[in-house]
């Protein structure tokens, strides 16, 4: 079947990285610079994605595969194929329309992206706060007071990192 198909369509013999050149008697020509074909039998090569400005080349274009972009330092990718670059914030902040803002009391963000989220409410699980929350870190829940048998030494919480808060009880 392959032999029959190639007799009928010489273009099917053209491998990835080439195109079937109608201007040259349908011979397989290499893709021109800044273009690629990822499959065989192509009649044209596709233009490569160009990473410019805030977009940075993560993977160079080759004759058989497209370039891939990510974002310059201080930004992170959003959208299909990194179609947007969103500004990073510091841990303990979230991005608003007016730029990076500190998390409100009772919320935290441990990443450079995303929104501030409420501290865990330990009491909902019948537990107590072992380590207080900060803008950058969630509270750490410990065993409930009832779980500590009489005479057992209670856990001393480590010093909070910065601006300690208290989980809403």
């Amino acid at each position: 079947f392959e032999r029959t198909r190639s007799l009928q369509d010489p273009c099917s013999n053209c491998p990835a990285g080439t195109f079937c050149d109608n201007n040259r008697n349908q011979i397989c020509s290499p893709c021109p610079p800044n273009s690629f074909s990822s499959a065989g039998g192509q009649r044209t090569c596709d233009i490569c994605r160009q990473c410019k400005g805030v977009f940075r080349t993560r993977k160079e274009c080759s004759s058989t595969s497209n370039a891939e972009c990510d974002c310059t330092p201080g930004f992170h990718c959003l959208g299909a194929g990194c179609s947007m670059c969103e500004q990073d914030c510091k841990q303990g902040q979230e991005l608003t329309k007016k730029g990076c803002k500190d998390c409100c009391f009772g919320t935290f963000n441990d990443q450079k992206r995303g929104i501030c989220r409420p501290w865990t409410n330990c009491s909902l699980d019948g537990k107590s706060v072992l380590v207080n929350g900060t803008k950058e870190r969630d509270v750490v829940c410990g065993p409930s007071p009832a779980d500590l048998s009489p005479g057992a030494s209670s856990v001393t919480p480590p010093a909070p990192a910065r601006e300690p808060g208290h989980s809403p009880q």
Epitope: D46, R49, V54, A80, G81, S83, C85, Q87
Partner: antibody, heavy 123, light 107 residues
Framework: EVQLVESGGGLVQPGGSLRLSCAAS??????????VGWIRQAPGKGLEWIGD???????YYNPSLKSRVTISRDNSKNTLYLQLNSLRAEDTAVYYC???????????????WGQGTLVTVSS | DIQLTQSPSSLSASVGDRVTITCRAS??????LNWYQQKPGKAPKLLIY???TLQSGVPSRFSGSGSGTDFTLTISSLQPEDFATYYC?????????FGQGTKVEIK
């Protein structure tokens, strides 16, 4: 508030040159990731990208104009420039400068535009 | 260069109508496509970026969809201020290119 104000348009002789300015306010041309470009529109026609310049100083040009165009900037004045040489009648257009990217999300879209300046190439 | 072909070139519609404009790219451009509105004598205004993200301050009746080669701008209920020319623009590679425009006129 981001503002872009173009100046320098007017009547130019064929074969001459033009130098347009674009004064930016509300942001810095040297802010990381930010690009500013020039786009033109011939009377009654569509939009044509001329080129752009980024915070790093790297420039990109439309190949159809590359041999005649230079985009530059003066960070101290927060001003962008477009130099176009060997002018011909078909360069008659409104020339816009525009900032790429939105407030905190950047990419090659033009979110802020100047009012445009008309350049007429005629003898 | 990547060519963008808009259709229709012009259309007549009434206030309240749902209007759809399409933009076809000469090859796949993923989601690297933007939409603008331009009124006579004014600079273009960004409506949609990255195929489907609504620019801040743009009414929610505008929406964008599509990826690859076929993209759509939809105005869910046309308002008097929406009569204008609309352009798509790709940023997959340079030169950045625009569609030829679609003029939306009053029926």
């Amino acid at each position: 508030e981001v503002q872009l104000v173009e100046s320098g348009g007017g009547l130019v002789q064929p074969g001459g040159s033009l130098r347009l300015s674009c004064a930016a306010s509300g942001f810095s041309l040297s802010t990381s990731g930010v690009g500013v470009g020039w786009i033109r529109q011939a009377p009654g026609k569509g939009l044509e990208w001329i080129g752009d310049i980024y915070h790093s100083g790297s420039t990109y040009y439309n190949p159809s104009l590359k041999s005649r165009v230079t985009i530059s900037r003066d960070n101290s004045k927060n001003t962008l420039y477009l130099q176009l040489n060997s002018l011909r009648a078909e360069d008659t257009a409104v020339y816009y400068c525009a900032r790429e990217g939105s407030t905190a999300v950047l990419g090659d879209w033009f979110a802020y535009w100047g009012q445009g300046t008309l350049v007429t190439v005629s003898s | 260069d990547i060519q963008l072909t808009q259709s229709p070139s012009s259309l007549s519609a009434s206030v309240g109508d749902r209007v759809t404009i399409t933009c076809r790219a000469s090859q796949s451009i993923s989601s690297y496509l933007n939409w603008y509105q331009q009124k006579p004598g004014k600079a273009p205004k960004l409506l949609i970026y990255a195929a489907s993200t609504l620019q801040s301050g743009v009414p929610s009746r505008f929406s964008g969809s599509g990826s690859g080669t076929d993209f759509t701008l939809t105005i869910s209920s046309l308002q008097p201020e929406d009569f204008a020319t609309y352009y798509c623009q790709q940023y997959y590679s340079t030169p950045l290119t625009f569609g030829q425009g679609t003029k939306v006129e009053i029926k």
